[in-house]
């Protein structure tokens, strides 16, 4: 039975040209995390494997940095980076947990962070 929840940074905004950290945290389960995938819409950005470490998609290598932790740092943001991001936790024995983050990249210097929220 899947008892865990994923807490994410929720709806966030950042300035064009700046950086942002996408962060998810799996709680309320003793399941072992074997791999975390980060996706933007249907495109795979990065993989963090418990044994084999980080792999970043070549398409994003210049602008995506692993971490902190199981999170992902996006750099040199453009308006095109606006959209949904998903952290997909592969765990044993629970299975797969998915968290959602919506990033809005703003032209102006007004970029407020949204509140944290939980996805069961």
């Amino acid at each position: 039975m899947m008892t865990g929840t994923i807490e994410t940074t929720g709806n966030i905004s950042a300035e064009k040209g700046g950086s942002i950290i996408l962060q998810c945290h799996l709680s309320s389960t003793t399941a072992q995390v074997t791999q975390v995938n980060w996706e933007q819409q249907d495109q795979l950005l990065a993989i963090c494997n418990a044994d084999l470490g980080w792999h970043i998609s070549p398409s994003f290598k210049d602008r995506v940095a692993p971490g902190p932790g199981l999170g992902l740092t996006l750099q040199s943001l453009t308006v095109n980076d606006t959209g949904e991001y998903f952290c997909i936790y592969h765990t044993y024995p629970d299975g797969t947990y998915t968290g959602r983050i919506f990033l809005e990249v703003l032209e102006s210097s007004v970029a407020e962070h949204g509140a944290r929220f939980q996805i069961p």
Epitope: L44, I47, A50, D51, P58, H90, Y92
Partner: antibody, heavy 121, light 109 residues
Framework: QVTLKESGPTLVKPTQTLTLTCTFS??????????VGWIRQPPGKALEWLAH???????YYNPALKSRLTITKDTSKNQVVLTMTNMDPVDTATYYC?????????????WGQGTLVTVSS | QAVVTQEPSLTVSPGGTVTLTCRSS?????????ANWVQQKPGQLFRGLIG???NRAPWVPARFSGSLIGDKAALTLSGVQPEDEAEYFC?????????FGGGTKLTVL
């Protein structure tokens, strides 16, 4: 639709080098998290993993056969080539290639039909 | 090099439940062995069922599940169908290489 097809000689003489080609469609080896592996099965025996190669050219080999094996990819042709030197009659087997997917642990997701290679003088 | 052992054959009745196991000669199988299960039906291509111990491929019915039972990797089929009759191979990852088991011939009788 993902398909893979193995090609190469059906008969090889002992001490010769075997070159097998896996031609695939439905995915690209330039795509993040994609890979292709080679596996063989001698008649009436178990599967034996030989080697695999990832999108980033990272290569892994069966330790017992490492000195005899070379795996390469040609992304533009959608092909992976396996060479095996110093062939012996015990290497007679059906050789398979398979797509490996790093992203969802589907390491041996799709397989080709296999090609039977006989080693005999 | 490690040796991976499977039951050579198992028989199950339609609608029943059966568990196939995969043992490693080096000790307990863990999630770091990323157990894979591959199916081959007579006259058909091999196809991947389970990877990373418990991750079902998208085309695999929910009646197939992967797990660790004791010191072995396991593939459990619940509500077995006649079309599940096939040979099942497991593969374990050992840091830098894969080792396949000898396969289990599953008969649905």
């Amino acid at each position: 639709q993902v398909t893979l097809k193995e090609s190469g000689p059906t008969l090889v003489k002992p001490t010769q080098t075997l070159t097998l080609t896996c031609t695939f469609s439905g995915f690209s080896l330039s795509t993040f998290a994609m890979g292709v592996g080679w596996i063989r099965q001698p008649p009436g025996k178990a599967l034996e993993w030989l080697a695999h190669i990832w999108w980033d050219d990272d290569k892994y080999y069966n330790p017992a056969l490492k000195s005899r094996l070379t795996i390469t990819k040609d992304t533009s042709k959608n092909q992976v080539v396996l060479t095996m030197t110093n062939m012996d009659p015990v290497d007679t087997a059906t050789y398979y290639c398979a797509r490996m997917d790093y992203s969802y642990f589907a390491w041996f997701a799709y397989w080709g039909q296999g090609t039977l290679v006989t080693v005999s003088s | 090099q490690a040796v991976v052992t499977q039951e050579p054959s198992l028989t199950v009745s339609p609608g029943g439940t059966v568990t196939l196991t995969c043992r490693s000669s080096t000790g307990a199988v863990t999630t770091s062995n990323y157990a894979n299960w591959v199916q081959q039906k007579p006259g058909q291509l091999f196809r991947g069922l389970i990877g990373g111990t418990n991750n079902r491929a998208p085309w695999v019915p929910a009646r197939f599940s992967g797990s660790l039972i004791g010191d072995k990797a396991a593939l459990t089929l619940s509500g077995v169908q006649p079309e599940d009759e096939a040979e099942y191979f497991c593969a374990l990852w050992y840091s830098n290489h894969w080792v396949f088991g000898g396969g289990t011939k599953l008969t649905v009788l």
